[in-house]
């Protein structure tokens, strides 16, 4: 007959390290008569004997997981009791192994240009993994903009178009390495303006064509505008290379207009638009048209504030659905092409630019607008501005005073009334009026009607030969 | 749909100094005249100050020169008042106000829900 | 200082025709001073009907027109209803010497 023996454990439990869905194995040898009860614990909660996820064999001495999972890491502890002294106790602890897993993949992203773009990249795995990146064939190279975060998503700092592309990322450690999808990347840029449409002084009846081109991402539309509204009529000819449109709009040109052509895209929900606005005037109205629709207001705008005489009231052409804010459109535009001109020509083509579009106005039964007297514009053209003008003319259409993709609407002089024939039908130019008060370098003028002074010039303009067309009376 | 949204008014001690803002959504702030427009407890409608699109000029109401300042960022569709120098008689409620078109005297279309602003000891 | 002048009160009855009338203490009102209309309900921020003299601001019904009578400017309610009443101001467009723009200081309107 055999003696009673305590419990003894002669394998003690070891780690067990095991991959993810593999099978993972505790032995735990006892020694002991009568035979022991043996039980096991993870991290000190009982494990059931029913649990399917386990098969205890060998009277309770081997614990086998039949499919780790990685919830399954632990201490494990196996007891050994039967009566015979006190109940022994085993433990070894399950490290649960794991490749790479991603589990928050990157996904594709639509990202306006400057804006920080994050692509995701959050990864299971043990050891830990290492994030990389690669773009296109190959590997991502951190910058001061390019950086992977801890977490292994990628962070773009103020985007760049040259950022678009197809991005993956890559988990790594000793057990393996797991690449996520391809994913896009889409910069999308506003809508801008590249070429402006130009403005036109034509004859009534002609063709005119207006032209506006575009860059965006995604590529923008055009749309054009006049006087506020849709374009009721003329043709629209579009044409799109890369991320550029190019809209040619022709006009059969009946009475002015403002052309507005108006760029957008889409990001998202929301919308950007780049506008450019140029004008379409008739140089020679006939009798018919001269009865023109307007009225006699204060002007309210601020460009012209300082040029205009103070409380007198302005033409305002109801050819505009809103005059008012057209006419100051126009001459906020123009009056940003003056900050290239001379300090000479400046002042004197604000003053001739201001009282041509915000003409001086008698009201009355039919509002009538007092163009410039033709000695002032002739004064401006050809001693103020006479080298701008002469840059410009062979660039331009009659009438039109140009620079670069900009306009200038300036009047055509020799069709303006002359201050001789008829003091009350013109306006003067006050700032004109004001320089030639300190003339002492310029000479006189000999002329059939009263010699008078010009607008102030440098003395070394003093040998300029002056027309008497310009004489000031 | 435009809206516009007044921020920092409150309780200020006579000499004292705020800034308000007027969030703008809905349109092209930047093409647009702004206005700023007060109206103390149980009295009428008073303009304080006007600001073109550009925000070029500024222009203020007489008793107000010198101690309130328009402004406005279009890159932040944001109308701006710094009031200086308060006084108890510019305790109002202070609404920003969108002005029809470029210019900063054009009529004003579109009104804020305003933010009081209290000046005393 | 040129004074923008309102009626202070106004009644009218549901169906009746108004005129308010927005004039200066010195002068005349001109199509020149855009004459604006807003109607203001106690709590509520002010809502703009007429611009420039005689344009109706969007949404705002043809009850209600703009014109300059003699030397004011006037607001006409045609058909008057129950929600209009309110406090209706002026505001008028001022350039002598600065730019100014100032209000009149309102009409209470009753609809009896």
């Known amino acids: 007959e055999k003696l009673p023996k305590a419990p003894v454990i002669t394998t003690p439990l070891e780690t067990v390290d095991a991959l993810v869905e593999e099978v993972a194995t505790f032995m735990c040898a006892v020694e002991s008569y009568p035979q022991p009860e043996i039980s096991w614990t993870r991290n000190k909660i009982l494990i059931k004997l029913f649990d399917t996820r386990y098969s205890i064999r060998e009277n309770g001495q081997l614990l086998t997981i039949l499919s780790v999972e990685d919830s399954d890491d632990g201490i494990y502890c196996c007891t050994a009791n039967n009566g015979v002294g006190g109940a022994v106790e085993s433990c070894g602890a399950l490290q649960v192994k794991m490749k790479p897993k991603i589990t928050r993949p990157p996904i594709n992203v639509k990202i306006i240009e400057g804006l920080k773009a994050v692509l995701p990249c959050t990864t299971m795995g043990n050891p830990k993994p290492s994030v990389s990146w690669i773009k296109g064939d190959s590997a991502l190279r951190e910058n001061s903009r390019i950086a992977v975060l801890e977490s292994g998503s990628l962070r773009i700092h103020n985007v760049q178009k040259e950022d678009a592309g197809q991005y993956r990322c890559v988990a790594k450690n000793s057990l393996g390495t797991a690449y996520s999808k391809l994913v896009k990347l889409e910069v999308e840029v506003f809508a801008r303006i590249l070429r402006a449409p130009e403005s036109h002084n034509v004859t009534f009846g002609s063709f005119v064509t207006l032209r506006c081109t575009a860059i965006g991402m995604p590529v923008p539309t055009i749309s054009w505008i006049e006087n506020g509204n849709a374009v009721s009529s003329g043709s629209i000819q579009e044409n799109v290379k890369d991320r550029v449109i190019d809209s040619r709009l022709q006009l059969f040109i009946t009475k002015p207009g403002l052309y507005t052509c108006i760029a957008t895209n889409k990001h998202g929900e929301k919308f950007s638009t780049a506008k450019a606005a140029a004008t379409v005037s008739i140089a020679e109205w006939s009798k018919s048209q001269k009865e023109s629709k307007g009225y006699c207001a204060q002007y309210r705008g601020e460009v012209c504030d300082a040029v205009l005489v103070k409380d007198s009231l302005v033409f305002f052409n109801t050819s505009y659905p809103d005059p008012e804010e057209a006419q100051e459109l126009l001459i906020h535009t123009a009056w940003n092409e003056l900050k290239a001109v001379s300090p000479l020509c400046r002042p004197a083509a604000e003053a001739l630019l201001c009282n041509h579009l915000f003409q001086e106005c008698s009201p009355g039964v039919l509002p009538t607008p007092m163009p410039i007297c033709r000695e002032y514009c002739l004064a401006v053209k050809e001693l103020f501005c006479a080298k701008e003008w002469l840059a410009m003319e062979g660039k331009t259409h009659r009438g039109l005073y140009r620079s670069g993709m900009h306009f200038l609407p300036v009047p055509e002089c020799s069709k303006l009334p002359s201050m001789h024939q008829d003091p009350t039908a013109c306006t003067r130019l006050p700032y004109l009026d004001y320089k030639k008060e300190n003339i002492t370098t310029f000479p006189s003028i000999t002329s059939s009607k009263p010699s008078v002074d010009i607008p102030n010039l440098p003395a070394s303009t003093s040998s300029f030969a002056v027309s008497p067309a310009y004489s000031m009376t | 749909e435009v809206q516009l949204l007044e921020s920092g008014g409150g309780l200020v001690q006579p000499g004292g100094s705020l800034r308000l803002s007027c969030a703008a959504s809905g349109f092209t702030f930047s093409d647009y005249g702004m206005s700023w427009v007060r109206q103390a407890p149980g009295k009428g409608l008073e303009w304080v100050s006007a600001?073109?699109?550009?925000?070029?000029?500024?222009y203020y109401k007489e008793s107000v020169k010198g101690r309130f300042t328009i402004s406005r960022d279009n890159s932040k569709n944001t109308l701006y008042l710094q009031m200086n120098s308060l006084r108890a008689e510019d305790t109002a409620v202070y609404y920003c106000a969108k002005r029809s078109g470029r210019i900063a005297f054009g009529a004003l279309d579109a009104w804020g829900q305003g933010t009081l602003v209290t000046v005393s000891s | 200082q040129t004074v923008v002048t309102q009626e202070p009160s106004f009644s009218v009855s549901p169906g009746g025709t108004v005129t308010l009338t927005c004039g200066l203490s010195?002068?005349?009102?001109?199509?020149?001073?855009?004459p604006d209309w807003y109607q203001q309900t106690p709590g509520q921020a002010p809502r703009t009907l007429i611009y420039s003299t005689d344009s109706r601001h969007s949404g705002v019904p043809d009850r209600f027109s703009g014109s300059i009578l003699g030397n004011k400017a006037a607001l006409t309610i045609t058909g008057a209803q129950a929600d209009d009443e309110s406090d209706y101001y002026c505001?008028?467009?001022?350039?002598?010497?600065?730019?100014?723009?100032?209000f009149g200081g309102g009409t209470k309107l009753t609809v009896l």
């Open positions: 600001i073109p699109w550009q925000g070029g000029s500024t």
């Open positions: 010195s002068g005349s009102v001109t199509s020149s001073n855009y």
């Open positions: 505001g008028l467009y001022m350039y002598s010497g600065s730019k100014n723009y100032v």
